[in-house]
């Protein structure tokens, strides 16, 4: 627009106006007249680029006329009043309403004054994110899925994670004409380390004040990963009882623990208590390989530990889990 003081009447309007599919929107358009300038407006006209004729006209003496009277309305222009506000309301926005519109004032004696406004027809998408529960495959698979449904224009989906991963994004037409559903898969080689970790799907769209963040808690199903703790290689005759623990990570949770030895069943000094194995005091040296076998829905895995109880004064040594 020309700077103030140029002595010219100018039309003020935003260059772009957003409106939502199915809703109504107002295309604002005003005539700005410098203080000392005299002007008389005889007609307001709205036209769409590329179409012949006017879609809406407000004449100083005849009032309004519309190409689609049920969908258009001058919001402020009134017969018998100064025509300074040409703002036009459009009802029931359709995809095909998107485009460039010209708002024109016929002023006397200054002549035509017009401005172009781009109407953007938007549809606010609905966003969801869900985990894709996977097993250990050894190759990249979708582990999370983020869907932005019925957006116009299509939403932008990005993933944020410390785990790496690759996005795979696709688009299909939405339920409503002119809208788009965007689906983004987050792809990674599954591992037990990833299970329970979070990834974030970030959805950006013109209709959002700020991006929407959707967190997905990853699920990887894997058989138990087993280790035995509680032994420090310093067990001696005469010590109090000690405890070994069978540490198992798995998804789903372990369904059973089974203790044994390489020779078969447990010796009398070893008592199984679920994930724990109680080692009672012994009076002679031993050298036994213990086995903990853990089962879950995906299978069984085991860990082995060779335990030695050696001769030597117990006061000089520390043993783990002595009571």
């Amino acid at each position: 627009w020309p700077p103030p003081g140029t002595g010219d009447v100018v039309v003020q309007a935003p260059t772009q106006v957003p409106g939502f599919l199915g809703d109504s929107v107002t295309l604002p358009c005003y005539l700005q007249v410098p203080n000392m300038e005299v002007t008389h407006v005889s007609q307001l006209t709205w036209a769409r680029h590329g179409e012949s004729g006017s879609m809406a006209v407000f004449h100083q003496t005849q009032g309004p006329s519309y190409s689609e009277s049920k969908r258009l309305e001058f919001v402020a222009a009134r017969l018998g009043a100064e025509l300074r506000n040409a703002s036009l309301r459009m009802f029931g926005l359709r995809v095909e309403d998107e485009g460039n519109y010209t708002c024109l004032f016929v002023t006397f004696p200054q002549g035509s004054r017009s401005v172009d406004i781009w109407l953007r027809v938007l549809a606010k998408p609905q966003n969801t994110a869900e985990v894709q529960k996977v097993q250990l495959t050894g190759e990249p698979v979708p582990m999370a899925r983020c869907v932005s449904t019925g957006g116009r224009p299509p939403a932008q989906i990005t993933w944020h994670s410390d785990l790496g991963g690759m996005p795979n994004t696709s688009q299909v037409p939405g339920f409503l004409s002119g809208t788009v559903t965007v689906t983004s898969l987050w792809i990674l080689v599954p591992s037990s380390q990833v299970d329970g970790k979070n990834v974030t799907c970030k959805v950006e769209h013109e209709s959002f004040e700020k991006p929407q963040l959707l967190t997905v808690n990853l699920t990887v199903y894997y058989p138990p990963e087993v280790s035995i703790s509680g032994y420090d290689n310093n067990w001696y005759l005469g010590q109090n009882e000690a405890t070994l623990t069978c540490d198992a990570r798995s998804n789903p949770e372990p369904t059973g623990y089974n203790w044994s030895t390489t020779m078969g069943p447990l010796p009398p000094f070893a008592v199984a208590q679920g994930a724990q194995l109680l080692i009672r005091p012994v009076d002679k040296p031993i050298n036994t390989t213990l086995i903990c076998n853990v089962t879950n829905a995906l299978g069984a895995r085991q860990a082995e530990l060779t335990v030695q109880v050696k001769e030597g004064p117990p006061s000089e040594h520390s043993g783990i889990s002595r009571n």
Epitope: T6, G7, D8, P34, M36, E37, V38, H40, S42, H59, Q60, T61, G80, V106, F108, P109, Q110, G111, S112
Partner: antibody, heavy 121, light 109 residues
């Protein structure tokens, strides 16, 4: 075709009033702007005022404010200019002019034949 | 009070080109002054030629063109014809009124 036909010559005494008419034909009168312009003997043109025929909205040259009134009668497609408190320097030929519109701007399109007003005691 | 000044008289040969100018006492003429040009031939009614600085009125020959020339409004006649001999007036808009120039008597000789 578009035509503006003005009333005949007038002779008036100082202090009197004169009302000049301008009958339009050949176009939609109510959508038009009409200016009144005068030309004193041996002088250039002087713009007096304009009127929008459809509503009667006016804009006067401040020099004439209070002495001049412009009106229209849409039933007869006639514009009127009344000038009061006449002085000898109001002696001039008075013209009505319809403004035409080209799609971008206005211009002084069609003029009446002029009405001579003589102010003399 | 704005004063609009035109050349009192100009002469052009038939087929020649002549430029009539319109100067404003308030400074440079701009598009906001909506320069109008009006022609009056002897014994005939006035006729509008140009509006809005450079918009030729319907029916006006293309040899007439309006423009801004430096700080003045200008009417250029290219390829003058004998019938173009007339008085030419410019009018400038000053926010709330039109002011006419004194006119230019153009002779085609």
């Amino acid at each position: 075709q578009v035509q503006l036909v003005q009333s005949g010559a007038e002779v008036k005494k100082p202090g009197a009033s004169v009302k000049v008419s301008c009958k339009a034909s050949g176009y939609t009168f109510t959508s038009s702007y009409i200016s009144w312009v005068r030309q004193a003997p041996g002088q250039g043109l002087e713009w007096i005022a304009w009127i929008y025929a459809g509503t009667g909205d006016t804009n006067y040259n401040q020099k004439f404010t209070g002495r001049v009134t412009m009106t229209t009668d849409t039933s007869t497609s006639t514009a009127y200019m009344e000038l009061r408190s006449l002085r000898s320097d109001d002696t001039a030929v008075y013209y009505c002019a319809r403004h035409g519109y080209t799609g971008r701007g206005w211009y002084f399109a069609v003029w009446g034949q002029g009405t001579t007003v003589t102010v003399s005691s | 009070q704005a004063v609009v000044t035109q050349e009192p008289s100009l002469t052009v040969s038939p087929g020649g080109t002549v430029t009539l100018t319109c100067r404003s006492s308030t400074g440079a003429v701009t598009t906001s002054n909506l320069a109008n040009w009006v022609q009056q031939k002897p014994g005939q009614a006035f006729r509008g030629l140009i509006g809005h600085t450079n918009n030729r009125a319907p029916g006006v020959p293309a040899r007439f063109s309006g423009s801004l020339l430096g700080d003045k409004a200008a009417l250029t006649l290219s390829g003058a014809q004998p019938e173009d001999e007339a008085e030419y007036y410019c009018a400038l808009w000053y926010s709330n009124k039109f002011v006419f120039g004194g006119g230019t008597k153009l002779t085609v000789l």
